[in-house]
């Protein structure tokens, strides 16, 4: 089976059940349902999944049985529309059920909520978790899939199966350990952090496909796969790009069974043809399916072939550039992007796409000019400032990070971004700026050759979080503009924003700066978030405050928290000292 199956199946549901096996089938249907109906209780979803699974088994037994010929969207949509509380729980999403496929599925997709109103997941005591795991392992793992899927409605479903496998392995090992907590908690922290990163990366892929189209996603994939597999031929890269695009289109479109099946086929193809693709795949290809697919997706770049010729000769100096371009524009541009990317693992994907766009724009203009060759002869000179801009930005920010450390670097970014887009909600500014700040510890440790791809491509992922959160409740024209004009220029667009001079400062509200003794029992991370929330609010009240003023207020605030957390009567300390702090801060900032 290739990724594109030409053979027709009488029953699509039977076909996928047989391909994936019962365990994966049930897990993927649960993920799909939880990603669509994010507010439904776990038990309701399990009931729906069991009904679908029983139906699939009847179709496996007899593909001609009643309704077995229906599409998966029809079957799943019909099942979702049986939920009794649809109108009360989801409001207008219930109107989707009046539509026919494919409009009904599109309607469900449009109602996916990137920031659902769900309680934060609180981790129970280790013994409680281990007991639950031993009492009913299957329910315990299903609950994990459900809770992640409903909070991350675009999570890459086959990858979530991989996370669930690791989650199970962690409990299997650690619940037998002498010190269960020491064994389990670091593993759960790692899974949580990796899961958040995986969710955000996939969200960018889906945004790329849904907001900018297949061509944008394919261009991204050509650049990335050419960097990763520089020894592979262009046709090989093109085939992988086509197949990868199909996989992600399916997952982003809610077609999770097809997506997981096709991803498995793609991994199989890559491993069968690794000699033509990359020398780095050997270890990945010896692993079981879920690990294999994950490993391939994360595999390091292969070594660049020796003696790659200069690109200038055929893409700039040749008199045939316009003839070649006119004959097959997308192939020619694809080849340019492939050739440039495989020579530049040191560039971010978004930079490579900016260069390719500049090249395309130049050819469009010059090939219509009187002397095309004269017109495009200097096109590579136009690349220089595009390359230097992210290089300089990363250099400056890494220096700042090394000087400040992560927490204070995040604070600098909080101030910077609040001044740029003060209309954005405080929780969003805190979340996004904290994540932007993590670029320092993630990327600045790398040598120069790895810094840009690490930093700028990570920033693209984080800024996409800002874009999808802002899209739900748009409040800033500047954010909308940077998010929608160009996918590859989002980061330079945000970088170029200055202080928003049109912003009317927020009214001062003492309640915003009132703190209680509960802050003392918070984890270091939660305490930081409290302080950073206060910092954003300060900037919203006083956008023209200087760095020095803000630093003084924040230092006073840190001292105040430390003092009151050591006090015998903490609550009284917070009440009395808090009033003094607010008054002193107002005076310092001239509020």
């Amino acid at each position: 089976r290739g990724v594109f199956r030409r053979d027709a199946h009488k029953s699509e549901v039977a076909h996928r059940f047989k391909d994936l096996g019962e365990e994966n089938f049930k897990a993927l249907v649960l993920i799909a349902f939880a990603q669509y109906l994010q507010q439904c209780p776990f038990e309701d979803h399990v009931k729906l999944v069991n009904e679908v699974t029983e139906f699939a088994k009847t179709c496996v037994a007899d593909e001609s049985a009643e309704n077995c010929d229906k599409s998966l969207h029809t079957l799943f949509g019909d099942k979702l529309c049986t939920v009794a509380t649809l109108r009360e729980t989801y409001g207008e999403m219930a109107d989707c059920c009046a539509k026919q496929e494919p409009e009904r599925n599109e309607c469900f997709l449009q109602h996916k909520d990137d920031n659902p109103n769900l309680p934060r997941l609180v981790r129970p005591e280790v013994d409680v978790m281990c007991t639950a795991f031993h009492d009913n392992e299957e329910t315990f793992l299903k609950k994990y899939l459900y809770e992640i899927a409903r909070r991350h409605p675009y999570f890459y479903a086959p990858e979530l199966l991989f996370f669930a496998k690791r989650y199970k392995a962690a409990f299997t090992e650690c619940c037998q350990a002498a010190d269960k907590a020491a064994c389990l908690l670091p593993k759960l922290d790692e899974l949580r952090d990796e899961g958040k990163a995986s969710s955000a990366k996939q969200r960018l892929k889906c945004a790329s496909l849904q907001k900018f189209g297949e061509r944008a996603f394919k261009a991204w994939a050509v650049a990335r796969l050419s960097q990763r597999f520089p020894k592979a031929e262009f046709a090989e890269v093109s085939k992988l790009v086509t197949d990868l695009t199909k996989v992600h289109t399916e997952c982003c479109h809610g077609d999770l069974l097809e997506c997981a099946d096709d991803r498995a086929d793609l991994a199989k193809y890559i491993c069968e043809n690794q000699d033509s693709i990359s020398s780095k795949l050997k270890e990945c290809c010896e692993k079981p399916l879920l690990e294999k697919s994950h490993c391939i997706a994360e595999v390091e770049n292969d070594e660049m072939p020796a003696d790659l010729p200069s690109l200038a000769a055929d893409f700039v100096e040749s008199k045939d550039v316009c003839k070649n371009y006119a004959e097959a524009k997308d192939v020619f541009l694809g080849m340019f992007l492939y050739e440039y990317a495989r020579r530049h693992p040191d560039y971010s994907v978004v930079l490579l796409l900016r260069l390719a766009k500049t090249y395309e724009t130049t050819l469009e203009k010059c090939c219509a000019a009187a002397d095309p060759h004269e017109c495009y002869a200097k096109v590579f000179d136009e690349f220089k400032p595009l390359v230097e801009e992210p290089q300089n930005l990363i250099k400056q920010n890494c220096e700042l990070f090394e000087q400040l450390g992560e927490y204070k670097f995040q604070n600098a970014l909080l101030v910077r971004y609040t001044k740029k887009v003060p209309q954005v909600s405080t929780p969003t500014l805190v979340e996004v700026s904290r994540n932007l700040g993590k670029v320092g510890s993630k990327c600045c440790k790398h040598p120069e050759a790895k810094r840009m791809p690490c930093a700028e491509d990570y920033l693209s992922v984080v800024l996409n979080q800002l874009c999808v959160l802002h899209e739900k409740t748009p409040v800033s024209d500047r954010v909308t503009k940077c998010c929608t004009e160009s996918l590859v220029n989002r980061r330079p667009c945000f970088s170029a924003l200055e202080v928003d001079e049109t912003y009317v400062p927020k009214e001062f509200n003492a309640e915003t700066f009132t703190f209680h003794a509960d802050i003392c029992t918070l984890s270091e991370k939660e305490r930081q978030i409290k302080k950073q929330t206060a910092l954003v609010e300060l900037v919203k009240h006083k956008p023209k405050a200087t760095k020095e003023q803000l630093k003084a207020v924040m230092d006073d605030f840190a001292a105040f928290v430390e003092k009151c957390c050591k006090a015998d009567d903490k609550e009284t300390c917070f009440a009395e000292e808090g009033k003094k702090l607010v008054a002193a801060s107002q005076a310092a900032l001239g509020l």
């Epitope: 031929e233 262009f234 046709a235 790659l308 070649n324 004959e327 097959a328 192939v331 050739e339």
Partner: nanobody, 125 residues
Framework: EVQLLESGGGLVQPGGSLRLSCVAS????????MGWFRQAPGKEREGVSS????????FYTNSVKGRFTISRDNSKNTLYLQMNSLRAEDTAVYYC??????????????????WGQGTLVTVSS
């Protein structure tokens, strides 16, 4: 219509060298992926080396890496294969082929659209 004409084959001793040439006429950007294939008696046709005539990137099958060099002269519409350190197992009919860079794969002869008639290379003492 693209036409390909090979030359340069012949008899050579083990360890010797040969240079094959392939003149292309009528080719365009969509046939700018060019390659050399070979077929030994009773065996399947296999890819030896390919080149993008726009971009200049080259690819080789493992058995000839370090011994064979593919090159092109766009001004003469000619493709070359310099073969050094020849071995008895290199004996075969060598074919020049052309196709679209978006499709051509050295390991799959069916992805090349145009073929020459072939030139025989015999390595024997």
């Amino acid at each position: 219509e693209v036409q390909l004409l090979e030359s340069g084959g012949g008899l050579v001793q083990p360890g010797g060298s040969l240079r094959l040439s392939c003149v292309a006429s009528g080719n365009t950007y969509l046939t700018s992926c060019m390659g050399w294939f070979r077929q030994a008696p009773g065996k399947e046709r296999e890819g030896v080396s390919s080149i993008y005539t726009v971009g200049g990137s080259t690819f080789y099958t493992n058995s000839v890496k370090g011994r064979f060099t593919i090159s092109r002269d766009n001004s003469k519409n000619t493709l070359y294969l310099q073969m050094n350190s020849l071995r008895a197992e290199d004996t075969a009919v060598y074919y020049c082929a052309a196709g679209s860079p978006a499709r051509c794969r050295l390991r799959d002869p069916t992805t090349f659209d145009y073929w020459g008639q072939g030139t025989l290379v015999t390595v024997s003492s």
